[in-house]
């Protein structure tokens, strides 16, 4: 069969080879399409409701005034010329609709290096057949499930028109030290050959490199955090960052109701002051960062002071990113 493609809504003419140019003609068209349950036979006499879908022209050709999805299928003509010689024509008709230019929606203006980020969602509306969406980075195709690239796709079909809407959501993990302004674009490739791809306008998000934070140091005086009853303990939170962040204090994981200060003095230590202390530095640019925890304990007279090893663990590290 000869392959024929036609745009939805446009006219299509199929020639009945071997048919006399003018009536009288001995010819018959047979259609097996989305409109027919089996083979539908059309003759030059025509008439009736089928005329709006397909009618035989005076020269024997079949005329479809405005093809639709239901017209996809096989069209056959059998014609006999004046000498009684029979000729058959066989067509496979497929229809297409070019969608509007695809668009990137919900696009990110900034990506964070080293972590997965949603770049945006590419949307193509009104295609037939469905076709495909693909992403490009700096003009080169991005391959899903490679190098931190993942794609979530969705295809919907319009209940009335039968046309497709495609969506493709791109997630990437930019490499540290990579391109600070990558260029992403998306393109729609039609489901039928011979039609060129449609590409979106590009987007250029910035890539933000998170700066590794220097540790918040907690210094305790006396060293080791063991003190006799009634003694004084001084806790100092040292943060190398500039400008100086706000310092809050925690005891046993609970914030202490004190104004921000880099120094915490515990005078006249009593049993109620015993516990695990840490400080939390809050930076305007990258959120709170907690120090290691230290254990404050009371030494009863005659007891040996604890070794430095009794100081608490390494703390919680970064609590959250801004």
């Amino acid at each position: 069969a000869q392959n024929i493609t036609a745009r939805i809504g446009e006219p299509l003419v199929l020639k009945c080879k071997g048919a006399p140019k003018k009536p009288p003609q001995r010819l018959e068209w047979k259609l097996n399409t989305g409109r027919t349950e089996a083979w539908k036979v059309l003759s030059p006499q025509g008439g009736g409701p089928w005329d709006s879908v397909a009618r035989v022209l005076p020269n024997g050709s079949l005329f479809l005034p405005a093809v639709g999805i239901q017209d996809e299928g096989i069209f056959r003509c059998q014609a006999m010329n004046r000498n009684g010689k029979e000729t058959k024509s066989n067509y496979r008709v497929r229809v297409y609709q070019i969608p509007g230019k695809p668009e990137i929606v919900d696009s990110a203006s900034e990506l964070t290096a080293g972590v997965p980020n949603k770049v945006g969602t590419c949307v193509s509306e009104g295609s037939y057949p469905a076709g495909t969406l693909s992403w490009h980075l700096d003009g080169k195709p991005l391959v899903p499930n490679e190098k931190g690239v993942s794609v979530k796709e969705q295809t919907r079909r319009h209940p009335e028109t039968g046309l497709f809407t495609l969506q493709s959501e791109l997630m990437v993990t930019p490499a540290r030290g990579g391109d600070p302004r990558p260029t992403f674009s998306c393109s729609f490739s039609p489901g039928l050959p011979r039609h060129r791809a449609l590409r979106t306008a590009p987007i250029q998000p910035r890539v933000w490199e998170p700066v590794p934070l220097e540790e918040v140091q907690l210094v305790v005086e006396p060293e080791g955090g063991a003190v006799a009853p009634g003694g004084t303990v001084t806790l100092t939170c040292e943060v190398p960052a500039q400008p100086s962040p706000q310092i809050h204090w925690m005891k046993d994981g609970v914030p202490l109701p004190l104004p921000p200060s880099p120094v915490l003095i515990l005078p006249e230590i009593g049993p109620q002051d015993q516990g695990t202390y840490s400080c939390v530095a809050t930076h305007s640019s990258h959120g709170p960062q907690e120090s290691r925890a230290v254990s404050i304990s009371i030494i009863e007279p005659g007891e040996e002071g604890p070794t430095a090893g009794s100081v608490g663990g390494s703390g919680l590290g970064t609590l959250a990113l801004a």
């Epitope: 020639k15 005034p65 405005a66």
Partner: antibody, heavy 115, light 110 residues
Framework: DVQLQESGPDLVKPSQSLSLTCTVT?????????WHWIRQFPGNKLEWMGY???????NYNPSLKSRISITRDTSKNQFFLQLNSVTTEDTATYYC????????WGQGTLVTVSA | DIVLTQSPASLAVSLGQRATISCRAS??????????MHWYQQKPGQPPKLLIY???NLESGVPARFSGSGSGTDFTLNIHPVEEEDAATYYC????????FGGGTKLEIK
Amino acid sequence: DVQLQESGPDLVKPSQSLSLTCTVTGYSITSGYSWHWIRQFPGNKLEWMGYIHYSGSTNYNPSLKSRISITRDTSKNQFFLQLNSVTTEDTATYYCARGGDFAYWGQGTLVTVSA
Amino acid sequence: DIVLTQSPASLAVSLGQRATISCRASKSVGTSDSSYMHWYQQKPGQPPKLLIYLASNLESGVPARFSGSGSGTDFTLNIHPVEEEDAATYYCQHSRELYTFGGGTKLEIK
């Protein structure tokens, strides 16, 4: 017999939207064909604007794509033209027609764009 | 876009003579099976009226003195013999890739 009739305002202000209705009698717009809007400028130049297919899908003249929308109301057997951000250049006689063979046209309606 | 160029822009023909109008497309509006070119007649205050569809098919109700021919990029509308009522503007139109109209030819009867 198939008949088409355009209706809508005959005067539209610049920057506003032009909205026209085509009412079809004698044939269901969901049965077949494509249903078109065509305009004719004062100098008689004809311009095809776009169509809505019997299935509901649309195609538009690329030069108008950003401003045009063709929709339909199947219960009333009507289809509609909306043209946004009009200028005086959009002054024309607007026709609706049945496509495929363009054997049937409306009588046309003159729309003037003027402040 | 396919551009259609009609010639001449106007012509005057004596009653009973032949009128020939040409339409040239900037690229082919045909396939191996057919040519997607149509011809219309328009009189003042009226919409265009279909005369010929698909290059050579006479629309029902149109007098046989109208005929169309051509393929690919070159098409012709012939009117013979011309009658008084044929004074009008004639347009070609293609439907190969979307649609465009020619600029029109005004026919005057001498």
